[in-house]
């Protein structure tokens, strides 16, 4: 039961995380105008990965897409790439994990195949989450660098009384959405990998040794279960318990083996 719960929860957490990564990537508020001493502004600027926007106090908002590819900073291109790779990997991971879910039956899919798929989707989620966290962090670092640079030249004199106040940008909501979403996807991926260990079939190709005791005879299989990752021999999960005897290891470590018949 615990494996099913871990796998199901991992799937749901990853699903929320990937939805968050998609949302963050599409959001316009990656960087927002720093309002420092001026909490109410007549013109408010904010920027995303795909377009920049201006909101006037009149309520009018105008957004302009970045219609150039070569003219954009390399860092912005890198962030875009990281976020897209994260979304693609996450989407593939979700697709794979749907078929890997224990609660979903697809033909006569073996446990080893489900274990493999669970591990694959888990790794995909981990990489997806890392891509999102990396993308958001790179953008945040770019903002911090630019922030201090523009603070250094905050007021540039233009002769006499004329001043140009430079617009500084600070962290936008999308950065926090991205960090949280990346973290959730990462956690979901780890949960899927943990669930995979519980799903993996055991090696059962031991020879049973018969011990004849006085009274009644019981056939024991010596030794506990050998943990398998599912990448070794493709042993089918068939166990015969004579007399219903079970080892302590089996009961504690692998309760999920008896979740279904």
């Amino acid at each position: 039961m615990a494996v099913t719960a871990c796998q199901g929860l991992g799937f749901v957490v990853s699903l929320i995380g990937i939805a968050g990564i998609i949302a963050a990537t599409c959001m316009d508020q990656w960087s927002t105008q720093d309002l420092y001493n001026n909490p109410v502004t007549a013109v408010f600027n904010y920027q995303g990965l795909w377009r920049s926007c201006v909101r006037e106090s009149s309520g009018f908002t105008e957004c302009r897409g970045y219609f150039t590819l070569l003219g954009l900073p390399a860092m912005l291109q890198a962030v875009r790439a990281l976020m897209i790779v994260g979304i693609v990997l996450g989407a593939i991971g979700l697709l794979v994990s749907i078929f890997a879910l224990k609660c979903i039956r697809i033909g006569s899919m073996e446990d080893s195949a489900k274990a493999n798929m669970t591990l694959t989707s888990g790794i995909m989620f981990i990489v997806s989450g890392l891509c999102a966290i990396a993308g958001v962090s790179v953008f945040a670092n770019m903002l911090v660098t630019n922030f201090w640079m523009s603070t250094a030249n905050m007021y540039t004199g233009m002769g006499g009384m004329v001043q140009t106040v430079q617009t500084r940008y600070t962290f936008g909501a999308a950065l926090f959405v991205g960090w949280v979403a990346g973290g959730l996807t990462l956690i979901g991926g780890v949960m899927m990998c943990i669930a995979c260990r519980g799903l993996a079939p055991e090696e059962t190709n031991y020879k049973a040794v018969s011990y004849h005791a006085s009274g009644h005879s019981v056939a024991y299989k010596p030794g506990g279960f050998k943990a398998s990752t599912g990448f070794g021999s493709n042993t089918k999960n068939k166990k015969i318990y004579d007399g219903g005897a079970r080892t302590e290891d089996e009961v504690q470590s692998y309760p999920s083996k008896h979740d279904y018949v």
């Epitope: 600027n45 006037e56 106090s57």
Partner: antibody, heavy 118, light 113 residues
Framework: QAYLQQSGAELVRSGASVKMSCKAS????????IHWVKQTPGQGLEWIGY????????NYNQKFKGKATLTADTSSSTAYMQISSLTSEDSAVYFC???????????WGQGTLVTVSA | DIVMIQSPSSLTEKAGEKVSMSCKSS????????????LTWYQQKPGQPPKLLIY???TRESGVPDRFTGSGSGTDFTLTISSVQAEDLAVYYC?????????FGAGTKLELK
């Protein structure tokens, strides 16, 4: 077509307060800021502040904080400005205006003349 | 606060002549986010409220005759009337629409010879 109708001229005593109104029609009142502007022969046009009728948010020119109070009643599509502790310097024409692209004021009321007597 | 300085304070021209008036701001009114200048021009005739002529420094409001042209960027702006008409006699104000508090110039009074 949007239209702003302001209340009539006021003659008030020094030290008293006055409340003028600005009734909006022809547009969704709660969706646009209503700004107030003071005009005197000496000082020209001065921006007092604005109110967003949708949620009652206000933003004042520091010079008029404590002097002017902006309110709005969405049920009657009316904005109000109260000026307290009147002095001769408050004698002016007060306009209400609705904002537009570029934070400009496209629709204006006809103005309310306030005369402060000693 | 941003200070708006208009010049000249008054000017007299013959009908049909081209006229220009200047407006200078103490801070740049150019917004880097959309490359627009937040400067507005108004026309006010005696006994009337101001009338919007131009916003974003050069965008003419609908219904405003095309003889009115706004130009300039940053801190220096100009309103030009290509051929002055009798109905153009008024006071012209420029306004900072970029930073609170919004501020107006003292105005340029246009008179006819």
């Amino acid at each position: 077509q949007a239209y702003l109708q302001q209340s009539g001229a006021e003659l008030v005593r020094s030290g008293a307060s006055v409340k003028m109104s600005c009734k909006a029609s022809g547009y969704t009142f709660s969706s646009h800021n209503i700004h107030w502007v003071k005009q005197t022969p000496g000082q020209g046009l001065e921006w007092i502040g604005y109110i967003y009728p949708g949620n009652g948010d206000t933003n004042y020119n520091q010079k008029f904080k404590g002097k002017a109070t902006l309110t709005a009643d969405t049920s009657s599509s009316t904005a109000y400005m109260q000026i307290s502790s009147l002095t001769s310097e408050d004698s002016a024409v007060y306009f209400c205006a609705r904002d537009y692209y570029g934070n400009s004021f496209v629709y204006w009321g006809q103005g309310t003349l306030v005369t402060v007597s000693a | 606060d941003i200070v708006m300085i208009q010049s000249p304070s008054s000017l007299t021209e013959k009908a049909g002549e081209k006229v220009s008036m200047s407006c200078k701001s103490s801070q740049s009114l150019l917004n880097s986010g959309n490359q627009k200048n937040y400067l507005t021009w108004y026309q006010q005739k005696p006994g009337q409220p101001p009338k919007l002529l131009i916003y974003w420094a050069s965008t003419r409001e609908s219904g405003v005759p095309d003889r009115f042209t706004g130009s300039g960027s940053g801190t220096d702006f100009t309103l030009t009337i290509s051929s002055v008409q009798a109905e153009d006699l008024a006071v012209y104000y420029c306004q900072n629409a970029y930073r609170f508090p919004f501020t107006f110039g003292a105005g340029t009074k246009l008179e006819l010879k």
